[in-house]
């Protein structure tokens, strides 16, 4: 078999609100995939499981199950949505994402990614993990390249 | 506003220990982290560790590890840091800071530990 | 652990004129870098955060720029009370370690 490519193309749109009186950080982050099967049959992407962490510490999962089908030697663009929570011990964060006196809140959070796929009952992981810049203090959308969006989004518990 | 107050100096004995203490008023104590910074006479700025109030959490300095330990008492809104076996290497100025993201904006105004016979 | 080599260790500059102090990072840390003003006998200072913000009541003459491994402090038209050590300080990982000082002295 020839290789299943998984490429982190990078955050797609980060949209952020805020709990006041918790001090706490809510933000939705889509991030963006290529997929390229490099084979001459099908390949099934069964999964893909993602995580983000801030500081060390995972602040939001997220899994997507039976994904998509693609075909011999073509490439899928995949969108996915980690919901993100900083709270409690990284609340001192609030202060600066709420900040008025500066215009960009730029945060660094590690974006980590698991691909699933199957061929002939044969399955492979493939992980990609990346730091990106993340505006928390609002709604940003990235300049990346069009791509469907699929909301079959299952957060981890 | 946003304080810590800190005793001005405390005298130790060689071999003996010394509890170090930082007083917050100004905000809720238990939603930012306490650092403690140490400063040598005509030395840097060393990082020793930090405490969470909320929950007791702490990290340290691995160069600290044996010999600091840092406590809170949420009840009184104060930060401890108890320093063990002094010798005169120990003989500096600890500051304790208030934690943000980036930065350390509000510090105390040190304690002058004296390690002398 | 980090380190953090900081430049110039001193240096001696007259009233009116513009500093820079760089301070040059042995991994990359995006934006989780300070900058600190200390005068003798006193408390560390927050001047910059998150590499290029002012902290509040910070003179706009003072402005932090860079991001990964290379940033600087720069000081334009210069005031007497500018004198002091300025630190910078990481904030990727802990140990949160500080640069070694550089002493700005006013001719």
């Known amino acids: 078999p020839r290789s299943i490519e998984v490429k982190y193309i990078g955050v797609k749109s980060a949209y952020v609100s805020y709990d006041a009186e918790k001090r706490t950080i809510y933000l939705n982050i889509t991030n963006t995939l290529n997929i390229t099967n490099n084979n001459y049959y099908s390949v099934e992407v069964e999964n893909i499981t993602a995580q983000v962490q801030f500081s060390k510490t995972v602040i939001g999962k997220a899994r997507l199950n039976n994904i998509t089908n693609i075909g011999p030697l073509d490439m899928k663009q995949i969108d996915y949505t980690v919901p993100t929570v900083i709270a409690e011990e990284m609340s001192y964060m609030y202060d600066f994402c709420t900040l008025l006196s500066i215009k960009v809140h730029n945060i660094v959070l590690m974006m980590q990614v698991t691909v699933t796929t199957a061929y002939f009952g044969h399955s492979e992981q493939i992980s990609q993990e990346r730091y990106q810049y993340v505006d928390c203090g609002r709604n940003t959308t990235y300049q990346l390249a069009q791509s469907e969006y699929l909301n079959v989004l299952q957060p981890q518990q | 506003q946003v304080q810590l107050q800190q005793p001005g100096a405390e005298f130790v004995r060689p071999g003996a220990s010394v509890k170090l203490s930082c007083k917050a008023s100004?905000?809720?104590?238990?939603?930012?982290?306490i650092t403690w910074v140490k400063q040598r006479p005509g030395h840097g700025l060393e990082w020793i560790g930090d405490?969470?109030?909320?929950?007791?959490?702490?990290n340290y300095n691995e160069s600290f590890k044996r010999k600091a330990t840092l406590t809170v008492d949420t009840s009184s809104s104060t930060a401890y840091m108890h320093l063990s076996s002094q010798t005169s290497e120990d003989s500096a100025v600890y500051f304790c800071?208030?934690?943000?993201?980036?930065?350390?904006?509000?510090w105390g105004q040190g304690t002058l530990v004296t390690v002398s016979a | 652990d980090i380190q953090m080599t900081q430049s110039p260790a001193s240096l001696s500059v007259s009233v009116g004129e513009t500093v820079t102090i760089t301070c040059r990072v042995s991994?990359?840390?995006?934006?989780?870098l300070a900058w600190y003003q200390q005068k003798q006998e006193k408390s560390p200072q927050l001047l910059v955060f998150a590499a290029t913000n002012l902290a509040d009541g910070v003179p706009s003459r003072f402005s932090g720029s860079g991001s990964g491994t290379q940033f600087s402090l720069k000081i334009n038209s210069l005031q007497s009370e500018d004198f002091g050590t300025y630190y910078c300080?990481?904030?990727?990982?802990?140990?949160?370690?500080f640069g070694s000082g550089t002493k700005l002295e006013i001719k």
């Open positions: 100004g905000y809720t104590f238990t939603n930012y982290w």
């Open positions: 991994e990359n840390i995006y934006n989780n």
């Open positions: 405490i969470y109030p909320g929950s007791g959490n702490s």
């Open positions: 800071a208030r934690k943000a993201y980036g930065g350390f904006p509000y």
């Open positions: 300080q990481h904030f990727w990982d802990t140990p949160f370690t």
